[in-house]
């Protein structure tokens, strides 16, 4: 009774198609699969960025897999062949591992890469990224930004740079069609007569870096002798009302009375007859139903009521 063995996949490699971090892992079937013609061979693939504690694990019948990686670090992957128990009249058989690594050979000392990279997707419409030049680089150093997301044929270079002292320190992106809810990859590289410049890679999803416009049309409505309803409207733009959280700051007679977070465009406030002045501001953020993270908008213009008569139906600024 001979022990059943299977070889690992052949030609296992990580291929970089130039998408700034979106890589292809590919392989060929193992040698000597003739004995298992009636069998569907599977592959167990494990991969990670070097330095990561955990492996991602995939079981597939395909000869390729694609995923995003942080190109600031190396990538390691391993794969083995799996013969399901149905093929072996017993337990599952696994081959030894085939292993491979990939990294971008760096150039330049780390200090030369861009510092404080910051990207904001304003009102879910306009992406703007800004950075500071690397430490100790001369004014002849220029940085270039490239980006890619699934749907683009190839990585594109920024065409509208923000400049300071002749250096590129940011990028205003064009309209980015169908670019949210998927990984958005950026590389900022550079050139200098003086010294080599280290490239930097960034990955994020646009819906997680949205900074909305502040709410508008703040109003007061008397609900009862001791209640006032504060109302506002969502700002113009593509973000639907269901995607907003709001933070309100209310001041009564120059004292902060309430800071509250609410999910809709109203807030009911208990008041006393002694109130001489009431002011509030509100700001918005994309909520957990539409993103994993977000940036608070600026505060709205302040809306105040002053005087004794709170019986007016609506008080506008």
């Amino acid at each position: 009774d001979t022990e059943i063995k299977v070889n690992p996949p052949q030609d296992f490699e990580i291929v970089d198609p130039g998408y700034l971090g979106y890589l292809y892992l590919q392989w060929q079937p193992p040698l000597s699969l003739d004995h298992f013609k009636e069998c569907t061979v599977e592959y167990e693939l494990k991969y990670r960025n070097i330095g990561s504690e955990t492996w991602k694990t995939i079981i597939t019948k395909n000869l390729h897999y694609k995923d995003g990686f942080d190109l600031n670090k190396g990538i390691e992957a391993k794969i083995h062949t799996l013969l399901p128990w149905q093929c072996t009249n017993g337990s599952e058989v696994q081959s030894s591992w085939a292993e491979t690594t990939y990294w971008i050979s760096p150039q330049g000392i780390p200090e030369t890469k861009v510092q404080d990279m910051d990207c904001v997707y304003y009102n879910w419409q306009y992406l703007l990224c800004s950075w500071k030049p690397g430490i100790g680089v001369l004014l002849d150093t220029n940085y270039n930004l490239f980006y890619w997301y699934e749907g683009l044929d190839h990585a594109l270079q920024c065409v509208d740079y923000i400049k300071a002292d002749g250096q590129n320190i940011g990028c205003r992106f064009p309209y980015l069609e169908a670019s949210d809810y998927k990984d958005f990859y950026i590389c900022v590289n550079g050139s200098s007569e003086n010294k080599p410049i280290r490239s930097s890679y960034f990955t994020f999803q646009l819906q997680n870096i949205v900074k909305p416009l502040p709410p508008v049309y703040l109003t007061f409505t008397r609900e009862s002798s001791c209640e006032i309803k504060l109302k506002w409207s969502i700002p113009l733009g593509p973000i639907p009302a269901r995607c907003f959280d709001y933070e309100i700051e209310i001041r009564e007679d120059d004292t902060t009375l309430v800071t509250a977070t609410v999910e809709n465009e109203t807030y009911t406030l208990k008041t006393t007859n002694e109130t001489r002045q009431l002011c509030f501001v509100v700001r918005s953020k994309v909520n957990i139903y539409c993103s994993d993270d977000g940036i608070w908008s600026e505060w709205s213009d302040k809306q105040c009521w002053e005087g004794e008569d709170l019986s007016k139906k609506t008080l506008l600024r």
Epitope: W103, S105, P106, G108, I109, P110, E111, G136
Partner: antibody, heavy 116, light 108 residues
Framework: EVQLVESGGGLVQPGGSLRLSCAAS????????VHWVRQAPGKGLEWVGV???????DYNSALMSRFTISKDNAKNSLYLQMNSLRAEDTAVYYC??????????WGQGTLVTVSS | DIQMTQSPSSLSASVGDRVTITCTAS???????LHWYQQKPGSSPKLWIY???NLASGVPSRFSGSGSGTSYTLTISSLQPEDFATYYC?????????FGGGTKVEIK
Amino acid sequence: EVQLVESGGGLVQPGGSLRLSCAASGFSLTKYGVHWVRQAPGKGLEWVGVKWAGGSTDYNSALMSRFTISKDNAKNSLYLQMNSLRAEDTAVYYCARDHRDAMDYWGQGTLVTVSS
Amino acid sequence: DIQMTQSPSSLSASVGDRVTITCTASLSVSSTYLHWYQQKPGSSPKLWIYSTSNLASGVPSRFSGSGSGTSYTLTISSLQPEDFATYYCHQYHRSPLTFGGGTKVEIK
């Protein structure tokens, strides 16, 4: 097996020149950068410079005007051309492979003595 | 330039002792780019600890590293005869790359 072997050291007079070689095996200079680091007798380590895989170079600016790093990818070898040598350049010169922003393999070193 | 100051410059210790070497940078250094090398007389340096706390291949687990910003430490929990050597810290963050002056660990 990764190996780095330096050669070309020796005795040279002040003001003279010397060219050191570093023969690499077990990896390709098109994939890895290689540094030169020196160590004066009984002293600590001093970085000289690095030749990156892509061909660009970074130098210790204190030495840049007199020292030049080059490489020959076909021979998988790195070179350090040292001009206008001074007594304070007397040291063991090491080449070391760059890997993930550290120097993971070092050669055995070659001694350069600058003296009249 | 970033100056890397090691202390002590030398120390005498016995087998089994706990030994701590500190390295202070004149400017903040990312922990990713702070490494330690071991060098024995007549030999070239060896990468010993990389990125502050990761042991290089073959380095015994009695060695550990820690720190952040400007202050970093190499610790040997129980000194063994083969650990007697000189240890150098090294910053790979800013040009020029610099090394500490070394700490020589000698047998008491």
